[in-house]
């Protein structure tokens, strides 16, 4: 047993039929010695009486908030949570496996620079009794500081016959250098609990492989004279890092017939401008990725032909 | 180049032969389809290559101050990845296929490294790990975890060589 | 928190075959060569065998080469050891255990509780 | 002949020191390898301790006291792992380890009785 934070405590249990449990006491706290009861929850039922209270928790049943009274006044609470462990291995029911980008991903993470500030969010059935707590650092054994928000439900979306909520946090390093090679990973650790049961979820990754920049803004098109082509300019987004002498971004143009089908012609540069083709009914789009570490693309920018 | 008295490098070249390294490095270990290695408290793994850190003045205020400090760093860094990828580690079984681009990445890593110190002047070098006689799974795994350290490091100095070529080129 | 957890252990007569499985969580299994090593009651650490983190190199010690087979899932996290012909000198806790791999050394981090294979008619 | 010899036991005394040798057959130079070491509590696994090669190339495990330190003996191409101030936690099986030959190869262990 461990306290999670004042007064709430998490029962660690191997989760198996007719597993034995784990014994807890509970110590009332107050300075009183005598006439003190033990309840449960809303109920009435004395469980015991004393200083402390001996229980054998196996179940769901045996968690939830004990109170201890005297003479009608309550005297102090301890809410006890269960983390079940099946098969040597901690549940994992609160939060949706998204996959991605591999299996048991809870936890998923992207930065739009090198500032130190990222967003993490993740999925869940659950609609109610459910709280959560992030907390983050950098590096594990000497861990640096990193202030992450409250989460919040940032999504909701059906899923066939479920509904499934997004949410998100946002995070801060707090002593951020843009400009150095990382050599300690950020640690992100999600404490969830969705009425009696607590779970922890994980996720280590470095700022590098989580930055997705913005897409290009102002993308404008310049027809040229006597000529189907066009020049496709373009302008870093404002979220990313600056001087771009420093923080420099590749770009992929694409020129994208109205039908999927038809074939897409690539153009990769390093300037914020191309010449492409451009076709009736066809449409231009821009994505950006940093120009010297493979992280993840951005969304694309797109502009009509026409 | 980077001389005794300090002068400067030859930023253009090396922005060139630094944004190669940086598409070699990917080019061999792309990421898709491989496991991923940003390790749990891995700690003691970072430790064992050399690193661009906050007080390095590799960022774009302290290259105008004194580039000396970084480009020194740096140096250390591409000998240190040259020897790497030049020992028992690589060149050991299993073999790398044959068109591996490992070979390239290794002679452009001793290329920039040469263009930043030309011979006659001696910057210290970071010192190598002894390497034990490694296993062949061990040297399958290192391969992969010095790649994808490698490519964290050529980028921050392809970074430091674009701003370097943009903003101090004489 | 990592966590290995072996299973499949028994008695087992000897020539017959027996499956362990060792369990992983808490850390990215693919990025870990993974060992197996007995301990025969009241003696020492025996290795016998290794696979590397993508299951292509696979090493047995003398004493179980042809008879055991190591081997990994990595979608679900699990380590395996087929043993067949088992003989009496076989009976042993059976460990897994995790590999840290670096520059300068190698060696078994975590390691699984054990689980007992007793061979005997 | 055993590719790595430990004494099969030692005694001694809380607050005193232990020299735990792991010896490495002949043809097979110790000053060429990396030298692990475990304990082992009765009934759990073995945990790792250190590693040593040289002054400048050793290791202490995460966690591990500065009361357990390694070294070698050249002349007698052994291994050494030095316990001082011996405490009664300290009571365990010792081993000593290298790779060699694609191969990871553990010594028959030292049971160190703290009396």
């Known amino acids: 047993i461990w306290e999670l934070k004042k007064d709430v405590y998490v029962v660690e249990l191997d989760w198996y039929p007719d597993a034995p449990g784990e014994m807890v006491v509970l110590t009332c706290d107050t300075p009183e010695e005598d006439g003190i009861t033990w309840t449960l929850d809303q109920s009435s039922e004395v469980l015991g009486s004393g200083k402390t209270l001996t229980i054998q928790v196996k179940e769901f049943g045996d968690a939830g908030q004990y109170t201890c009274h005297k003479g009608g006044e309550v005297l102090s609470h301890s809410l006890l949570l269960l983390h079940k462990k099946e098969d040597g291995i901690w549940s994992t029911d609160i939060l949706k496996d998204q996959k991605e980008p591999k299996n048991k991903t809870f936890l998923r993470c992207e930065a739009k620079n090198y500032s130190g500030r990222f967003t993490c969010w993740w999925l869940t059935t659950i609609s109610t009794d459910l709280t959560f707590s992030v907390k983050s650092s950098r590096g594990s054994s000497d861990p640096q500081g990193v202030t992450c928000g409250a989460a919040t439900l940032s999504a909701e979306r059906v899923r066939g016959d479920n509904k499934e909520y997004e949410y998100s946090v946002e995070c801060q390093e707090d002593s951020a250098c843009p400009a150095a090679e990382e050599s300690l990973p950020i640690e992100v650790m999600v404490d969830a609990v969705h009425k009696l049961k607590y779970e922890n979820y994980t996720s280590s990754f470095f700022i590098r492989d989580i930055i997705k920049p913005d897409p290009p803004k102002n993308l404008q098109l310049k027809p040229l004279k006597n000529s189907r082509q066009v020049e496709v300019s373009w302008e870093y987004p404002d979220t990313w890092s600056t001087p771009h002498s420093y923080f420099s971004l590749t770009f992929c143009v694409q020129v994208q017939g109205k039908s999927k089908r038809e074939k897409k012609d690539r153009v990769f540069t390093d300037k914020t401008s191309a010449t492409v083709i451009c076709r009736k009914n066809a449409s231009i789009s821009v994505r950006a990725q940093d120009r010297y570490y493979s992280s993840s693309w951005s969304e694309w920018a797109s502009v009509p032909c026409s | 180049r980077a001389v005794p008295g300090g002068s400067s490098p030859a930023w253009t070249q090396c922005q060139q032969l630094s944004q190669k390294l940086c598409t070699l490095a990917w080019s061999a270990h792309p990421l898709v389809g491989h496991m991923d290695l940003r390790e749990e408290g891995d700690e003691e793994t970072t430790n064992d290559v050399p690193h661009i850190q906050c007080g390095d003045g590799c960022d774009p205020q302290g290259l105008r101050d004194n580039s000396q400090f970084c480009l020194q760093r740096i140096h250390q860094g591409l000998i240190f990845y040259e020897k790497l990828l030049g020992s028992d580690i690589f060149t050991g079984e299993p073999s790398l296929l044959p068109d591996s681009p490992v070979g390239q990445l290794h002679a452009s890593l001793l290329g920039l490294s040469q263009l930043l110190q030309p011979e006659g002047h001696h910057w210290e070098t970071q010192q190598i790990p002894s390497l034990s006689p490694s296993q062949p799974w061990q040297r399958l795994l290192l391969r992969f975890k010095i790649l994808r350290s490698l490519q964290a490091f050529v980028a921050v100095a392809a970074r430091v060589f674009a701003h370097g070529a943009a903003t101090l080129s004489p | 928190q990592v966590q290995l957890v072996e299973s499949g252990g028994g008695v087992v007569q000897p020539g017959r075959s027996l499956r362990l499985s060792c369990a992983a969580s808490g850390f990215t299994f693919s990025s870990y060569a993974m060992h197996w090593v007995r301990q025969a009651p009241g003696k020492g650490l025996e290795w016998l065998s290794v696979?590397?983190?993508?299951?292509?190199?696979?090493y047995y010690a003398d004493s179980v080469k042809g008879r055991f087979t190591i081997s990994r899932d990595n979608s679900k996290n699990t380590l395996y050891l087929q043993m067949n012909s088992l003989r009496a000198e076989d009976t042993a806790v059976y460990y897994c255990?995790?590999?840290?791999?670096?520059?300068?050394?190698?060696?078994?981090?975590?390691w699984g509780q054990g689980t007992l294979v007793t061979v005997s008619s | 002949q055993a590719v790595l010899t430990q004494p099969s036991s030692l005694s001694a005394s809380p607050g005193a020191s232990a020299s735990l040798t792991c010896t490495l057959r002949s043809g097979i130079n110790v000053g060429t390898y990396r030298i692990y070491w475990y304990q082992q509590k009765p009934g759990s696994p073995p945990q790792y301790l250190l590693r040593y090669k040289s002054d400048s190339d050793k290791q202490q495990g995460s966690g591990v006291p500065s009361r357990f330190s390694g070294s070698k003996d050249a002349s007698a191409n052994a291994g050494i792992l030095l316990i001082s101030g011996l405490q009664s936690e300290d009571e365990a099986d010792y081993y000593c380890m290298i790779w060699h030959s694609s191969a990871s190869v553990f010594g028959g262990g030292t049971k160190l009785t703290v009396l």
């Open positions: 696979i590397s983190h993508d299951g292509s190199i696979k």
């Open positions: 255990a995790r590999e840290r791999t670096t520059l300068s050394g190698s060696y078994f981090d975590y």
